[in-house]
């Protein structure tokens, strides 16, 4: 994947938080829930209660104002969706709260959220040809397609 | 799928104003950006702004800076654009647009043609 | 304001032929921190709103037949009907938006020879 070295220079700032509560459905529509402390995965729900809740955090970046950079956070919790390399699982890393600046290898805390339709698509920051995407049998984890799922549609209101 | 209906047709006098309203049905403007784009007769398109109501963040042309507002209601289901100030030369149909947080078009109104004349 | 240059202005071919558009930005429309060029191809018809067709300069849009492709990067790109047929006779539009204001080429009106 490419690397985000020539990312340094940009500075993301936070503005606010813009969703809260919402639930991640693939186009299986199976829901993102915990697999452990650490690992998300994804099943399908009769009960959506079970499924993660999170929050979306709006950034902008020094370097251009037109793309719509997120972080996300599980509800209620500092748990923050981290990316690592290509086909491994995102981390839920803890932090005592929502950075305030990021930059530099603090950017897989990042992604560009994009949507198209019902479809909504979030792009790692620190790794740009890559998506936030769920595999059968394997965690939510980094991919560039198929046969991973790439696209994700957004349920509000759940809590 | 979102449709997008827009208000009728209207005739108005130079130096009034407009305000074209376009209701989403089927889904709502939350996570999406809007576009008000307009074409005159028989010319190309042309972007006069925008809003990104989950930022709520409007963006304007620079040409229509000053008589331009974009708004959307509360329930995230209805956008409307007035323009004030009118001329002859802003009689055009009027679209607007939606469906993606870009600025790009997926769905689109039907459009509302405005005529400006004395 | 990115200026969107779109050539030829008309386009005349015959059925099952290829036709090729070609749109030019004045400023790269590739956003280098994802690689994605923010550039879309609308198809318009008289009477009609535009239609998306392509997104992300090269992203076919769900229900658009695959004889429309879109390619090109930076500031460079290019439309293509691989067999032109006779629904497809419109005005096309290029779009950038990578900055504000998007910015639309001027339309290429493709007829049948």
């Known amino acids: 994947s490419a690397p985000f070295s020539f990312l340094s220079n940009v500075k993301y700032n936070f503005m606010r938080i813009i969703k809260y509560e919402f639930i991640l459905n693939d186009a299986l529509n199976q829901s993102i829930i915990r697999a452990n402390d650490q690992y998300l995965t994804a099943a399908a729900l009769h009960n959506l209660d079970e499924a993660v809740k999170f929050d979306m955090g709006a950034y902008k970046s020094s370097k251009d104002d037109a793309k719509i950079t997120v972080i996300l956070r599980i509800s209620k919790t500092q748990l923050y969706v981290t990316a690592q390399d290509e086909d491994q699982p995102v981390l839920l890393k803890e932090m005592p709260e929502i950075p305030k600046t990021i930059t530099g290898s603090e950017t897989n805390l990042l992604f560009f959220w994009e949507t198209h339709g019902t479809k909504n698509y979030f792009t790692s920051v620190a790794h740009p040809n890559l998506f936030i995407a769920t595999k059968q049998d394997y965690w939510v984890c980094l991919a560039g397609g198929p046969p991973s799922i790439t696209d994700f549609q957004i349920l509000e209101n759940q809590a | 799928q979102v449709q997008l209906v827009q208000s009728g047709a209207e005739v108005k006098k130079p130096g009034s104003s407009v305000k074209v309203s376009c209701k989403a049905s089927?889904?709502?403007?939350?996570?999406?950006?809007i576009l008000w784009v307009r074409q005159a007769p028989g010319q190309g398109l042309q972007w006069l702004g925008g809003?990104?109501?989950?930022?709520?963040?409007?963006d304007h042309a620079q040409d229509f800076q000053d008589r331009l507002t974009i708004t959307v209601d509360e329930s995230m289901t209805t956008a409307y654009m007035e323009l004030s100030s009118l001329r002859p030369e802003d009689t055009a149909i009027y679209y607007c647009?939606?469906?993606?947080?870009?600025?790009?078009?997926?769905?689109w109104g039907q459009g509302t043609l405005v005529t400006v004349s004395s | 304001d990115i200026v969107m240059t779109q050539s030829p202005d008309s386009l005349a071919v015959s059925l099952g032929e290829r036709a090729t558009i070609n749109c030019k930005s004045s400023q790269s429309v590739l956003y280098s921190s994802n690689n994605k060029n923010y550039l879309a191809w609308y198809q318009q018809k008289p009477g009609q709103p535009p239609k998306l067709l392509i997104y992300w300069a090269s992203t076919r849009e769900s229900g658009v037949p695959d004889r429309f492709s879109g390619s090109g990067s930076g500031t460079d790109f290019t439309l293509t009907i691989s067999s032109l047929q006779a629904e497809d006779v419109a005005v096309y539009y290029c779009?950038?938006?990578?900055?504000?204001?998007?910015?639309f080429g001027g339309g290429t009106k493709v007829e049948i020879k």
């Open positions: 089927g889904g709502r403007f939350t996570n999406y950006a």
């Open positions: 809003i990104i109501p989950i930022f709520d963040e409007t």
């Open positions: 647009a939606t469906g993606s947080n870009s600025y790009y078009g997926l769905y």
């Open positions: 779009q950038q938006y990578y900055s504000s204001p998007p910015t």
